[in-house]
Interface confidence: low
């Protein structure tokens, strides 16, 4: 079941998933000037069995100007470089978490992908919190949150993290302290309020998402 909420708000903190539970959806978003191919998927879906999980569907972007040419999925090096650093790729993932049964790794980028990724999490998903640059973590417990089902409703557990305004940064599990971090968050993303949702649909609806009421079509 999809979590009908986003993880809790922690002032001056961001979160990250190290691996994605089966059922997680990732929107197929294209960068400005590009669009999904007409017959293309709206999202990728983490699927699998007990031994292996992978992302179903491929995201494909084509130039908004050209109607019928599709772009290959393999990204060019310069396109990977221009992606925002908000997408930390698999080197960041602790091996034990990324290889968990029933979980998918961060999908590789596709050509002309949008700069930010949009995930729809499912029950059981865990995310880890980190203080933004310029703030230091005070831990009272785990700096993580899990989406749980309680009495038929989904909720995220409260991470035990406080970020104080000292010029130090905390790390994700298994992450080294950055040296003048090229992977640090862009300044525009260090604001401290948070966002969330009410995406109340069952995971079995994922197959029909293309025609669901949550999808708006071009007029």
């Amino acid at each position: 079941e999809l979590c009908d909420d986003d993880p809790p708000e922690i002032p001056h903190a961001t979160f990250k998933a190290m691996a994605y539970k089966e059922g997680t959806m990732l929107n197929c978003e294209c960068k400005r000037g590009f669009r999904r191919i007409k017959s293309g998927s709206l999202y990728m879906l983490c699927t699998g069995n007990s031994s292996h999980s992978s992302w179903d569907n491929q995201c494909q972007c084509t130039s908004s100007a050209t109607r019928n040419t599709t772009k290959q999925v393999t990204p060019q090096p310069e396109e990977q470089k221009e992606r925002k650093t908000t997408e930390m790729q698999s080197p960041m993932q602790p091996v034990d978490q990324a290889s968990l049964p029933g979980h998918c790794r961060e999908p590789p980028p596709w050509e002309n992908e949008a700069t930010e990724r949009i995930y729809h999490f499912v029950v059981g998903q865990m995310v880890y919190y980190q203080c933004v640059q310029g703030y230091r973590a005070l831990h009272r417990g785990p700096a993580e949150s899990v989406c749980k089902m309680t009495h038929g409703k989904t909720r995220w557990t409260q991470p035990q993290l406080i970020c104080t305004g000292e010029m130090e940064t905390s790390q994700f599990p298994g992450e080294e302290k950055p040296q003048a971090s090229p992977e640090g968050r862009p300044e525009s993303e260090t604001s401290c309020l948070v966002t969330t949702t009410d995406f109340q649909i069952q995971t079995e609806m994922a197959a029909t998402m293309e025609t669901s009421i949550f999808t708006t079509e071009y007029q």
């Epitope: 986003d6 997408e87 990724r117 949009i118 993303e189 966002t195 969330t196 009410d198 998402m209 708006t216």
Partner: nanobody
């Protein structure tokens, strides 16, 4: 990819109420976007009014409208609303609906700055007379 159209603007007496709507269209999942309302009075900057997270769990308001304005959204209808109660003459402005892409890999917060929004509507005029 996302088109926004505001409606519901008009004239209202001070102390009255008005409800603005913003309908989204485009082949995309509406619940992927955080939404906000901004307003621009003649000769002034476009100011943040309030924002709502993609599933409506979190909201944020400018101090000037707190306890008077309420933002809500209906993802099934791809619409965000601004309920304006106890209006004041200083609420007179063009009201704009805006959207930003939520990022789930690194957390993207509720945005309050206009340059953080990628999608904008054309605006709807609200006039509050005393």
């Amino acid at each position: 990819q996302l088109q926004l159209v505001e409606s519901g603007g008009g004239s209202v007496q001070a102390g009255g109420s008005l409800r603005l709507s913003c309908a989204a269209s485009g082949r995309t999942l509406y619940s992927s976007y955080g939404m906000a309302w901004f307003r621009q009075a003649p000769g002034k900057e476009r100011d943040f009014v309030g924002s709502i997270s993609r599933y409506g769990t979190y909201t944020s308001y400018a101090d000037s409208v707190k306890d008077r304005f309420t933002i809500s959204r209906d993802n099934a209808k791809s619409t965000v609303y601004l309920q304006m109660n106890n209006t004041k003459p200083e609420d007179t402005a063009v009201y704009y609906c805006a959207a930003y892409t939520y990022s789930g890999s690194f957390y993207s917060t509720v945005k309050t700055h206009r340059d953080e929004y990628q999608y904008w509507g054309q605006g709807t005029q609200v006039t509050v007379s005393s």
